[in-house]
């Protein structure tokens, strides 16, 4: 029997490589049974996750799952970093794993560290 707890389907250590200037949708897949929970996005700043206010978000409903989407229109260089979605469900806060956006600034791509260089220097993400 499947759990009726809210579940957030973001993979641990997931990453997205994206270009500055492009549109991008960051999806938080949400599974719930009855009432759709209140979901928010935040961006990690050290060990604190700062709630993203005044950002365009939307819901996309599919048969077995819903997606809470954070819109980047367009992606900016300072969108680089790690994000987490959270759901309020029956007075409980459920947090997803963080997912990391690696933003390449097309204007200075040759000067930027590659994704693999970034991965070998995790302090860049904190």
């Amino acid at each position: 029997k499947e759990s009726c707890d809210v579940q957030l389907y973001i993979k641990r250590q997931s990453e997205h490589s994206i270009l500055a200037g492009d549109p991008f949708e960051l999806e938080c897949p949400v599974k719930y049974c009855a009432n759709r929970p209140h979901v928010t996005w935040c961006k990690l700043n050290g060990t604190t996750c700062v709630k993203l206010e005044d950002r365009q978000t939307s819901w996309k409903e599919e048969k077995n799952i819903s997606f809470f989407i954070l819109h980047f229109e367009p992606v900016l260089p300072n969108d680089n970093g790690s994000y987490r979605c959270s759901a309020n469900f029956q007075s409980n806060l459920i947090e997803s794993h963080s997912t990391t956006l690696y933003v390449t600034d097309v204007k200075s791509a040759s000067e930027r560290p590659s994704k693999d260089e970034m991965a070998s220097r995790p302090w860049l993400l904190y």
Partner: antibody
Framework: QVQLQESGPGLVKPSGTLSLTCAVS????????IHWVRQPPGKGLEWIGR????????KYNPSFKSRATISADKSKNQASLKLSSVTAADTAVYYC????????????WGQGTLVTVSS | DIQMTQSPSSLSASVGDRVTITCRSS???????????LNWLQQKPGKAPKRLIY???KLDSGVPSRFSGSGSGTDFTLTISSLQPEDFATYYC?????????FGQGTKLEIK
Amino acid sequence: QVQLQESGPGLVKPSGTLSLTCAVSGFNIKDTYIHWVRQPPGKGLEWIGRNDPANGNTKYNPSFKSRATISADKSKNQASLKLSSVTAADTAVYYCASYEGYYERFGYWGQGTLVTVSS
Amino acid sequence: DIQMTQSPSSLSASVGDRVTITCRSSQSLLDRDGKSYLNWLQQKPGKAPKRLIYLVSKLDSGVPSRFSGSGSGTDFTLTISSLQPEDFATYYCWQDTHFPYTFGQGTKLEIK
């Protein structure tokens, strides 16, 4: 029934490229990370790298980074490993493993395939 | 890279014995979410590894309750409370907190 099945040539010539496929059945690989791990005869396990089939993102062990290419095909529910410029030291049993990415709920391994590098 | 050091490298024991294998990491396996991503695998000769324990102490489905895992930070333990004949195998710890992921060198559990 869950199954991970590695396949590919059992013999590769030195300086050639080792190519293996991991066919998965019983679950959707997009919900997992696909890992490749090898085990030289009589030795321990060594992690080569892993792929996120959902978006293609791949991480490599720096020991293999310049030679290894890991990819996945969501539509075929399979993954592949290519290892170039092989030497006798690359002779090993190669395993693919699939670990659920959200809540660690499962971690399945293929049965492994022995690849010998020899002329 | 994180070094994973298992001890002992080999161990002789009898059916019914209580056995403990330790795994020490060269740095903390605590991830940003406050969890340690430490797995224990069992491998029998000529067979693929099988995950027994994940997240330090969670048993995979179908794994007998005589197996247990504990520890935190850098020190982890696999305990088999009462050895059964089918438990004689090689056991590996594996960390998947930090890249590149790394394995312990293995502990071979043999019949005394």
